[in-house]
Interface confidence: medium
């Protein structure tokens, strides 16, 4: 199990990352080597190192190892991006659960099961003992952390700081208890790295001892990180290749989460009458194969034995003997009742896309030529030839008329968010069509995300309103009221338009909402002279998945000393890392002594990759998101309200670069906030402002 060459499996890899020590007292050791495996072996055995090795960096360019007595969670250390570096951290030091008896546990829990603080191992007060760090080398008897140096039954323990209680076990959960999965674990991205019989998993990026096809670079969406259990191929549950040369692979013991329903985002589009895509979401009642032979029940083993049972494939709806596609086959199928024909496809089920032609688009859909002619809200598209005047108004080139046939969804203006069409409804002049990007299409809609090619600021200088520089006031800040109470923030980007978040509108009735502008106090106290109260006349929802809303005001705001607009960034721009920004909000804190005044938190921009690392790799950021971290350690980056802005300055110009939305890990110490990236949606915002009618003041 633990041959020398296999110790790299005990490390968590963070690609293109290194550690920089801020504290000069921290030691490091370097040496030229050929492979990361060599670094790992030395780190694991601590051979020739003047410290306990907790992590190392392999410098691929210089073929060099840097060993550390610290890891990314240690104080006095920061992570840094670097193409040539790969960071490897010993899992034992970053794991917060135990395997088996917890002999290898090296985490930082220092409280016993009943809540008593642990006594430091190097101390003899209040309890004398023989468990000295010097006597138990390699057992990491550091500080007062819970440990199990002898591998005893109860798991990690410690001597306690209570003179009445000599020692007690610590309440550290088993990793198999902490980890859970939904359905058959296809979306599981947890950290289980050993099989149900206790064998250590082989790294996915290694081909020894077992050669395999599941290369991380070939399947970037399958979560092939380190040597964690995964289910890339529709098995009943997650599995991995093992380090045992005699056992190619084994299942992992991961329990099913208490709520075994899939997230709405994981579920394929469910259909009952026809097949969408490969029919993984088909939930109809067809129960014969193409030639009429009846299907065998999924819960039966006669006439064909199989493991495609409802128990093994919990979320695949294997009811009765209905045709299904539980394993990613090309279309729904079943085992047949004919003993001579094991399986058959149910190819007689019609395809849902028959009526729509193409059901997906590539890139931004500018070459989409399907015949869908309905918007996402169900409005029928109007003929292109009736709308050419409007189209010319917002594009500066001659559209390809040959593509604009009938009233089919098209993308003549290179919209980043896919095909759209005009409607016959004057309130909603145009909208996107309910077509998705083709599965597996990775064409970026914005190029060069990580290179500051386009500046975010327009080239004009700072604008001044009535002699007061706009950057000294926050007149663009909007308090969205729901039934007379503040619920969200927003940004005034044009006299009649407020940019905010989709989740801020629990009710459909616009009479329930008001926008308050020009206030500093959330209750409007002392702001009577400057406050403007405006009704809401329309909500325009952003492109699918954006979480943005443009809220149209019933009448334009009057711009004055207290109310101003804030600029939008250029489309697709990149703001440099470490740019100083701020989030604003009245903070829906619920505290009794809350003074109700507008708050500001200062953040700095962080690159998406580094941001993902700060979130321990649990979130992958895409081109529609922007990340900003707090300057003060432990200061939550989202102290403002949902819907409120992330405001940054470039070339002396303030812009709204992000929007605060729920569910992106805000206000967690040391975790940067993730915001909707306004630059990605800037063209959509401009297009709405240009094409939607607004009342005149």
């Amino acid at each position: 199990q633990r041959k020398r060459r296999n110790t790299i499996h005990e490390f968590k890899k963070s690609a293109k990352t290194t550690l920089i020590k801020i504290d000069p007292a921290l030691k490091i050791k370097t040496k030229k080597v050929n492979t990361a495996d060599q670094c790992a072996n030395r780190c694991t055995r601590n051979k020739g190192l003047p410290f306990t090795c907790k992590a190392f960096v392999f410098d691929k360019a210089r073929k060099q190892c840097l060993w550390f007595p610290f890891n990314s969670m240690s104080s006095g250390v920061k992570k840094e991006f670097g193409h040539e570096f790969d960071l490897y951290e010993n899992k034992d030091y970053i794991r917060n659960c135990i395997i088996g008896k917890g002999r290898s546990y090296k985490g930082t829990v220092s409280i016993t099961k009943s809540g008593i603080k642990c006594q430091p191992w190097s101390s003899m007060i209040p309890h004398e003992h023989s468990f000295l760090p010097s006597s138990y080398r390699g057992k990491d008897l550091q500080e007062n952390y819970c440990r199990n140096p002898r591998g005893e039954e109860g798991g990690p323990w410690c001597f306690t700081s209570n003179p009445e209680v000599r020692y007690e076990v610590c309440d550290i959960p088993q990793c198999s208890e902490v980890e859970c999965m939904t359905c058959n674990g296809e979306s599981y991205r947890g950290l289980m790295d050993h099989t149900e019989s206790g064998k250590i998993c082989q790294r996915w990026d290694h081909q020894t001892p077992h050669r395999h096809k599941f290369l991380p670079e070939r399947y970037p969406d399958k979560g092939f990180d380190d040597n964690y259990c995964r289910n890339p191929d529709g098995q009943p549950r997650p599995w991995c290749y093992t380090l045992d040369p005699h056992t190619r692979w084994e299942y992992c013991a991961i329990k099913t989460c208490a709520d075994n329903t899939m997230n709405d985002t994981d579920v394929p589009l469910e259909t009952t009458e026809c097949i969408q895509g490969q029919g993984e979401g088909y939930r109809g009642t067809v129960n014969t194969i193409w030639n009429g032979i009846p299907c065998q029940r999924w819960d039966s083993q006669y006439p064909h034995e199989h493991d495609m049972t409802p128990e093994n494939f919990k979320c695949k709806d294997l009811r009765e003997n209905y045709c299904r596609n539980p394993d990613g086959s090309e279309s729904p199928w079943c085992f047949t009742t004919d003993p001579n024909i094991r399986v058959g496809y149910c190819s007689q089920i019609p395809n849902c896309d028959m009526s729509h032609g193409q059901d997906c688009y590539r890139g931004n859909g500018k070459n989409y030529m399907g015949n869908l002619s309905q918007t996402r809200s169900g409005l029928t598209c109007s003929m292109w030839d009736k709308n050419m005047e409007d189209l010319h108004r917002h594009i500066f080139w001659e559209p390809d008329a040959s593509k604009l046939n009938e009233n089919y969804c098209r993308n003549p203006d290179d919209d980043a968010h896919g095909p759209w069409c005009y409607t016959g409804n004057p309130l909603i002049p145009w909208d996107y069509c309910p077509i998705s990007r083709c599965e597996g299409d990775t064409t970026p809609t914005i190029v060069n995300l990580d290179h500051p090619v386009i500046s975010c600021a327009k080239t004009k200088q700072l604008r001044v309103v009535n002699g007061i520089p706009t950057r000294t006031n926050i007149g663009w800040m909007v308090s969205l009221r729901y039934r007379n109470k503040h619920i969200c923030g927003g940004s005034l980007i044009k006299e009649s338009w407020v940019l905010t978040a989709r989740q801020c509108f629990p009710s459909r009735d616009l009479k329930d909402y008001e926008a308050w502008l020009g206030i500093h106090d959330v209750h409007g106290r002392g702001d009577e002279k400057c406050k403007q109260v405006l009704n809401v006349s329309q909500l325009v929802y952003g492109p699918e998945g954006s979480d943005l809303v443009l809220m149209k005001l019933a009448r334009p705001a009057v711009l004055d000393d207290f109310v101003s607009t804030i600029d939008l960034p250029n489309y697709g721009c990149t703001i440099p890392e470490k740019t100083s920004c701020s989030v604003y909000g009245w903070g829906y804190t619920g505290l009794i002594n809350y003074d109700g005044l507008l708050r500001v938190a200062h953040l700095y921009i962080m690159g998406n990759e580094k941001c993902s690392q700060h979130h321990r790799g649990k979130v992958t950021l895409n081109e529609s998101e922007i990340c900003a971290g707090a300057e003060k350690i432990g200061s939550g980056p989202c102290e403002g309200d949902y819907g409120g802005p992330l405001v940054c300055e470039q070339h002396k110009m303030r812009m709204v670069l992000g929007v605060i939305v729920p569910g992106r890990g805000c206000a967690i110490p040391n975790r940067p906030g993730i915001f909707v990236r306004v630059a990605y949606y800037a063209k959509w915002i401009h297009k709405i402002i240009l094409t939607y009618k607004v009342p005149q003041s």
Epitope: T182, D259, N260, T261, R502, P506, S507, R508, Y588
Partner: antibody, heavy 114, light 114 residues
Framework: VEESGGRLVMPGTPLTLTCTVS????????ISWVRQAPEKGLEWIGV?????VTDYASWAQGRFTISKTSTTVDLKIPSPTTEDTATYFC?????????????WGPGTLVTVSS | DIVMTQTPSSVEAAVGGTVTIKCQAS??????LAWYQQKPGQRPKLLIY???TLASGVPSRFKGSGSGTQFTLTISDLECADAATYYC????????????????FGGGTEVVVK
Amino acid sequence: VEESGGRLVMPGTPLTLTCTVSGFSLSSNAISWVRQAPEKGLEWIGVIYVIGVTDYASWAQGRFTISKTSTTVDLKIPSPTTEDTATYFCARVYDSGWNHFNLWGPGTLVTVSS
Amino acid sequence: DIVMTQTPSSVEAAVGGTVTIKCQASENIYRLLAWYQQKPGQRPKLLIYSASTLASGVPSRFKGSGSGTQFTLTISDLECADAATYYCQNYYYSSRSSYDTYNVFGGGTEVVVK
């Protein structure tokens, strides 16, 4: 979703029911509380949205308080009466605002009696 | 208030037969209506939302129709397992009325299968 905290209480004794969620996030879904008196129909009490704001049925206003943490939603009954004897369900609201309930807990029984 | 009136309160039918349950709203609720099934001692289960869309895993024997103020749930090829109480739920509201005019359930219809 799973409710807990239901028990036999005397009238006027404050009670808190807890709805624990897993497998989905309260930052994506609103949660509603619904109750059902013995042998009676379903009665909607209130909702807590993604953004932490609450709404109540007018008969429930002042009689109940809904609050949440990252994985739990509480229903506080500050001064229960015998009419509050019922099974209390929490339900996941599809999406973040007004919508149907696509996932229900098994319910927790509250008996108010002297 | 928007009142949801469900009829009949109880209906009996034979295995293999068809049952029709009606739900009437006192004002236009468009298609913002859901149907739930509740068996004795169990949690409610979503059957249909948006008036006619079948929820995941629900057999196509259940059919919802209607819009505006008149809605119908039809259960065909009745099975013993369909014996339950069925509720309609309106999730539209208008702030012209008081705030408890949404997420209102009908009184329920008990379906007895012979």
